[in-house]
Structures are given as C-alpha cells and as structure tokens.
C-alpha cells in the first residue's frame, strides 16, 4: 500500500480516470473521452481536454492591434480528433461529414468543406494574444507589478518557460498578454503556449482544470484582479485560408 494508492488523482487534470496499477502501485491516469495516457506532471494537451469536456455530462461545465490574420475561436466547442500524441489532427470533421482544417490550438483556419477537403499539415500557432478587461478598481494597477504577477502565474501555475511570455501590456482597464513560441524554440518537455492559454482561459472563467486546487486568485500587491472579459487571438506560422466571402461578411 503506497502513498500513490492513497491519492491516485491527476494534479494537473481533473478530467481523468486514475488507478494505482502502474509499476510499484503508482498512479496511472487516462483522459476521459479518449482513454489516452496523461502525464500528470505537466499540462494536458488542449485536444484531449476538449475531447474530455465533450464526453462529460453537459452540466459539468501600449496595446497590440491583432494582425489581419489573427484568428478568434468563434466556433466554440466541438469533439476533436486527436493524434496518438494528443495533438489536434489537421483535419477535423463533424458527424455530418463537414470538414475543416485547424491550427495547433484546434481553431478553424479554413472554410468548411466536405470529406474531400485536404489539410496537408498541422499549422503551428506561434503567437497568442490574450486580451483581458479587468473590473473597475480604485486606481490603475502598477504596470511592472502586474507584469511580474502574470509572468509568475504562467511560470508557476502553468509551468510555461518565462521566455515564451513575450510581453505584458496594460492600458487600464485592458491587459494584453503575448505568448510566442516558434516550432524551433519549443524543446521536448516544454509546455505549449496553446495549452497554457487554454488552462488560463478556463481558470479565468472559474472552470479550473487542476485537481482539487482552489480557483484562480489573481492579486497584484494584494489587490484582487478580477477579469470581466477575455478575448484570445491566435496567429499561425502560415496565414489562414478563408474565402473573400467570409472576409467581407
């Protein structure tokens, strides 16, 4: 009887089923929905988390100007296809054989088509802009304190290497966090910026994915930072391919 058997849960992903049947009675966890093995020492990929979310009961649930190629996730939730490593497959289809191409964070980057649609590669999202508006406070937050607190959050809570937090911008009440991570920069074991952004998004919405941890309590010099709106823009290494019809709509 080991400590692992007493607390066989996944600290970084509550949407798992765990059992102490690994070597020496160690805890082995699998994601809901996909049954895929999950590494509980790091963040779970967004694809597996979305798949788990879709399998769960429904009631369980100086500022930068985004470039013309920035994508916003307007399509909402869907049940994704994940590859054996837990990444999004480049082509996603629904039950009615409508298909589309996605980027590495699972956001649609082409018009929808049929089963003949080809998505040659999974295009990497290398730049994420998280745009937040905080609730009114007595005064503006100190920019350097805010910067330090958000960098600490991404480093400690989401285990994202500090070099991937490119900048924190602030013009009250808007905060922008820029995450950048090129394919060449991401080493084995590095948390993906897309996964970190997704965990952050869920935290901000009060839907923490962490097991047993309290919700996100963001404070800057003791002052609560309460977010009332979040917008996330995704920039891909290759610009998306939408028809002019969509762009002029």
């Amino acid at each position: 009887h080991t400590a692992a058997q007493d607390n066989c849960t996944c600290p970084t992903n509550k949407m798992t089923v765990c059992s102490p049947d690994g070597p020496g009675g160690r805890c082995q966890c699998r994601a809901l929905g996909s049954g895929m093995a999950v590494d509980c020492s790091t963040l779970t990929s967004k694809c597996l988390l979305l798949k788990a979310r879709m399998s769960a009961p429904k009631n369980a649930r100086t500022l930068v100007r985004p470039s013309e190629h920035a994508l916003v996730d307007n399509d909402g939730l869907y049940d994704p296809d994940c590859d054996p490593e837990g990444r999004f497959k480049a082509r996603q289809c629904n039950q009615t054989s409508v298909c589309w191409c996605v980027n590495s964070v699972g956001v649609r980057r082409t018009d929808k088509g049929d089963l003949s649609l080809r998505c040659d590669e999974l295009v990497r999202t290398h730049h994420i802009l998280i745009d937040l508006r905080h609730r009114p406070t007595a005064g503006a937050f100190n920019h350097s304190d805010l910067d330090a607190e958000l960098r600490r959050l991404f480093r400690e809570r989401y285990r994202l290497h500090p070099k991937f937090v490119a900048a924190v911008h602030y013009e009250q009440p808007t905060i922008q966090i820029e995450l950048r991570q090129n394919t060449s920069q991401k080493a084995a074991g590095d948390v993906d910026i897309g996964d970190a952004a997704y965990y952050f998004e869920r935290d901000i919405k009060g839907e923490s994915l962490f097991q047993g941890r309290g919700g996100l309590d963001l404070r800057v010099r003791g002052e609560p930072l309460q977010v009332e709106r979040t917008l996330i823009y995704y920039l891909d290494e290759i610009p998306p391919k939408f028809s002019m019809k969509r762009l002029t709509a």
């Epitope: 692992a4 160690r26 093995a37 590494d39 020492s41 054996p84 490593e85």
Partner: nanobody
Framework: QVQLQESGGGLVQPGGSLRLSCAAS????????MSWVRQAPGKGLEWVSY????????YYADTVKGRFTISRDNSKNTLYLQMNSLRAEDTAVYRC??????????????WGQGTMVTVSS
C-alpha cells in the same frame, strides 16, 4: 521522430517461451525509461513490465511476475521481454513504450505498433 518497432511474436503452446525485441530510434534511448504493455483482444492496454534507463530497476505486473523478464541493451538501442511459462491468458498484442516514472505517477508517451503473441495448443 520517436520510433519503436517490436518483433519476436508468434504462436506458442502453453508452457512455452518467446523473446520479444523492440528496436528504438529517434530519441536518446539510453536515458529513457521503457515498458512493455499488452492489449488482449477486446480489452484495454495493460501495463506488463518496466525498466529504468540504466537497467538497474525493474517492475512487473502481478500477472506475469516470476515468468517474464525485462532487459535492455543500450548499446543496441533495444528493449527485450523474455516470456516463459506462457499461458492462454497471455495472448495479446505486445507493445513497447517509452515511459516516465515519478514517486507517485506513471505514464507512457510513445508506443510501438506491437507484435502479436498467441498462446494456444
């Protein structure tokens, strides 16, 4: 990219023996913990045996303890599973996997396609 290729499976009579091999490439094998897992027809993946990177620490599932032996040759980037006293319930696809062990948790992150072992008279 990570590649794991198993071989050595086949049809064997109850009580017989087989030696499985797994050739690894695309990652530093000598610093990776490894495991054998199996999947019986219609069942989920079951962990069978584990060996650490140096080969100094091994673990076995209760169902195979005393009958199976895991080993590795880091100079050849190869993992082995010696299976003795085989039983009908050992029939499965055997896959080698790159593994990770902490004080409390265990996970596999890459698997080979597998080799079929059938134990039948």
């Amino acid at each position: 990219q990570v590649q794991l290729q198993e071989s050595g499976g086949g049809l064997v009579q109850p009580g017989g023996s087989l030696r499985l091999s797994c050739a690894a490439s695309g990652f530093p094998f000598s610093s990776a913990d490894m495991s054998w897992v199996r999947q019986a027809p219609g069942k989920g993946l079951e962990w069978v045996s584990y060996i650490n990177a140096e080969g100094s620490k091994t673990y076995y599932a209760d169902t195979v303890k005393g009958r199976f032996t895991i080993s590795r040759d880091n100079s050849k980037n190869t993992l082995y599973l010696q299976m003795n006293s085989l039983r009908a319930e050992d029939t499965a696809v055997y896959r080698c996997a790159r593994a990770k062990l902490t004080d409390t948790h265990y996970v596999e992150d890459y698997w080979g396609q597998g080799t079929m072992v059938t134990v039948s008279s």
